[in-house]
């Protein structure tokens, strides 16, 4: 058993049929010595008396808010949550496996630049009685500070018969050094509590590996005289790190016909313009990637050829 | 060339070669990013790899003030990785093809380090480890990890030279 926060405790249980459970001793936070009784949740049934209460925690029915009273007055509370371990593995019932980039990916994180700011998100099908708490650091043995905000519900989607809820959190490294070569990864830890079930999820990454620039901005076409060719130009996204002579991007320009089956013409360039042939009903798209490190491409920015 | 007295390197040449290094480092092991290669330290682990750190002056401001500190650190790293790519981690079993990207990477690391280091002047360099793994798959795993680190190192070096070529070239 360990303390998650004040008056909230997590009991770690091996979860299998007829498991013996864990013996837990609760102590009433009071100078009083006698006349103390204990109840669980809203029930008025007295579970025991005395300054301490010993309980055998085996299942969710044994978890909940234990309260000690004296003469009708509440003295203190202890909320017990359960953390299930099945076959040596901690349960992951609350969050959905996003399966990208690999199985057992519960947390996904992205950064728009090298400023030390990043966003993580996760999915669940649970709609109520759900709380999240997020902590982060750079490195684990001698951790350097990363400040995370509160997790918020960022999207709701319908997936077949189920509703899926996306939560996200923004974090910022306290003393970020955008030009340095990272040697210690960022660690993100999410505590999830659903009703009386506790779970924790972790992710470890370098900012460089989760970089995904915003799409190029101000995408424009300029027809070239007496030619089917056009000059496409664009700019670095506002959110990208500066100066651009140091934090450089490379670009992919694509000409795509109306039909998905039509052959795509692609050009790669380090410049912020390119000359391409504009076909009727086609569209021109441009995306960006860090020039020197193969992290994710941005989403496409597009304009119609006409 | 980066002479100790502080004259400038051939920024444009360095830019071109460092960008080529980035391409080669990724073609040497493109899928390495999808592998779980996290390091687990214990009380005995020491990190002898020369990383480009915050105080090394490799940021745009630091380069403008005095690029020598940064260039020295980059040179140190280039020599370190060049030695590693020539060690039995990469030359032992399983064998690499003579024209593999690793062979080109090895040659390019040497080329860039020579652009930075004039004859007769020697910056101190990190020693590569002497105790070497005995099993082929141990070497294979280390290759992936070394290439992963090299990708990060040469990315920073390439940014430095691109910025230098754009802003510090005579």
């Amino acid at each position: 058993i360990w303390e998650l926060k004040k008056d909230v405790y997590v009991v770690e249980l091996d979860w299998y049929p007829d498991a013996p459970g864990e013996m837990v001793v609760l102590t009433c936070d009071t100078p009083e010595e006698d006349g103390i009784t204990w109840t669980l949740d809203q029930s008025s049934e007295v579970l025991g008396s005395g300054k301490t209460l010993t309980i055998q925690v085996k299942e969710f029915g044994d978890a909940g808010q234990y309260t000690c009273h004296k003469g009708g007055e509440v003295l203190s509370h202890s909320l017990l949550l359960l953390h299930k371990k099945e076959d040596g593995i901690w349960s992951t019932d609350i969050l959905k496996d996003q399966k990208e980039p690999k199985n057992k990916t519960f947390l996904r994180c992205e950064a728009k630049n090298y400023s030390g700011r990043f966003t993580c998100w996760w999915l669940t099908t649970i709609s109520t009685d759900l709380t999240f708490s997020v902590k982060s650091s750079r490195g684990s043995s001698d951790p350097q500070g990363v400040t995370c905000g509160a997790a918020t519900l960022s999207a709701e989607r319908v997936r077949g018969d189920n509703k899926e809820y996306e939560y996200s959190v923004e974090c910022q490294e306290d003393s970020a050094c955008p030009a340095a070569e990272e040697s210690l990864p960022i660690e993100v830890m999410v505590d999830a509590v659903h009703k009386l079930k506790y779970e924790n999820y972790t992710s470890s990454f370098f900012i460089r590996d989760i970089i995904k620039p915003d799409p190029p901005k101000n995408l424009q076409l300029k027809p070239l005289k007496n030619s089917r060719q056009v000059e496409v130009s664009w700019e670095y996204p506002d959110t990208w790190s500066t100066p651009h002579s140091y934090f450089s991007l490379t670009f992919c320009v694509q000409v795509q016909g109306k039909s998905k089956r039509e052959k795509k013409d692609r050009v790669f360039t380090d410049k912020t313009s390119a000359t391409v042939i504009c076909r009727k009903n086609a569209s021109i798209s441009v995306r960006a990637q860090d020039r020197y490190y193969s992290s994710s491409w941005s989403e496409w920015a597009s304009v119609p050829c006409s | 060339r980066a002479v100790p007295g502080g004259s400038s390197p051939a920024w444009t040449q360095c830019q071109q070669l460092s960008q080529k290094l980035c391409t080669l480092a990724w073609s040497a092991h493109p899928l390495v990013g999808h592998m779980d290669l996290r390091e687990e330290g214990d009380e005995e682990t020491t990190n002898d790899v020369p990383h480009i750190q915050c105080g090394d002056g490799c940021d745009p401001q630091g380069l403008r003030d005095n690029s020598q500190f940064c260039l020295q650190r980059i040179h140190q790293g280039l020599i370190f990785y060049e030695k590693l790519l020539g060690s039995d981690i990469f030359t032992g079993e399983p064998s690499l093809l003579p024209d593999s990207p690793v062979a080109q990477l090895h040659a390019s690391l040497l080329g860039l380090s020579q652009l930075l280091q004039p004859e007769g002047h020697h910056w101190e360099t990190q020693q590569i480890p002497s105790l070497s793994p005995s099993q082929p798959w141990q070497r294979l795993l280390l290759r992936f990890k070394i290439l992963r680190s090299l990708q990060a190192f040469v990315a920073v070096a390439a940014r430095v030279f691109a910025h230098g070529a754009a802003t510090l070239s005579p």
């Epitope: - | 390091e39 020491t46 002898d48 070497s132 005995s134 099993q135 798959w137 795993l141």
Partner: antibody, heavy 127, light 108 residues
Framework: QVELVQSGAEVKKPGSSVKVSCKAS????????ISWVRQAPGQGLEWMGG????????NYAQKFQGRVTITADESTSTAYMELSSLRSEDTAVYYC????????????????????WGQGTLVTVSS | DIVLTQSPATLSLSPGERATLSCRAS???????LAWYQQKPGQAPRLLIY???RRATGVPARFSGSGSGTDFTLTISSLEPEDFATYYC?????????FGQGTKVEIK
């Protein structure tokens, strides 16, 4: 903390097969080397083979080649050892063991010395 | 295969005494890829020494390893009651990774 939890004891008939599992909790499973070592009653230790899950490729002691198959499932952090054509002399406690991490420069890699062991699985082969 | 021969097969000593266990290899063990383990009845082995002379995490200083090439030694400077067990050496220089047959350290 990190532990290796093995499946329970098995009683098998000669000629049959046995598959023992070894589940790792905590730590990085993928780039570790998981070995299988057996110990017949009152006898010494015998290395059978091992696998590095990230590569999925196992290596085996010549003595067991063709009779043993070692596999790993990265998604569940579980390694498996299957031994076929069982005979009475295969009666033993079978251990899975994780390699100690060595350092090469700044990179860790698994040594062939085993610093974490499962609790052992007794396999009895009897007609 | 590299054959490891441990001697003596049994060592009878009293608590406080010094124990010297030998492990001889049939061919040279490169880079000192040799380990020592302790095993007590009904338990899994425990790594004591790796790289011939480095103590594993949490192993008391009374355990030390030495040697190179084909001759290796495990020394317990002053036997504690919990040290009475069987000790195995193992080479990891070549596959198969072989173990010695063990030395049992028993109370005299």
């Amino acid at each position: 903390q990190v532990e290796l939890v093995q499946s329970g004891a098995e009683v098998k008939k000669p000629g049959s097969s046995v598959k023992v599992s070894c589940k790792a909790s905590g730590g990085t499973f993928s780039s570790n080397y998981i070995s299988w070592v057996r110990q017949a009653p009152g006898q010494g230790l015998e290395w059978m083979g091992g696998i590095i899950p990230i590569f999925g490729h196992a290596n085996y002691a010549q003595k067991f080649q063709g009779r043993v198959t070692i596999t790993a499932d990265e998604s569940t952090s579980t390694a498996y050892m299957e031994l076929s054509s069982l005979r009475s002399e295969d009666t033993a406690v079978y251990y899975c063991a994780r390699s100690k991490k060595g350092m090469y420069g700044g990179w860790t890699y698994p040594l062939m010395m085993f610093d974490l062991w499962g609790q052992g699985t007794l396999v009895t082969v009897s007609s | 295969d590299i054959v490891l021969t441990q001697s003596p097969a049994t060592l009878s000593l009293s608590p406080g005494e010094r124990a010297t266990l030998s492990c001889r290899a049939s061919q040279s063990v490169s880079s000192n890829y040799l380990a020592w383990y302790q095993q007590k009845p009904g338990q899994a082995p425990r790594l004591l020494i790796y790289y011939a002379s480095r103590r594993a995490t949490g192993v008391p200083a009374r355990f030390s390893g030495s040697g190179s090439g084909t001759d290796f030694t495990l020394t317990i400077s002053s036997l504690e009651p919990e040290d009475f067990a069987t000790y195995y050496c193992q080479q990891t220089s070549n596959t198969p990774f072989t173990f010695g047959q063990g030395t049992k350290v028993e109370i005299k």
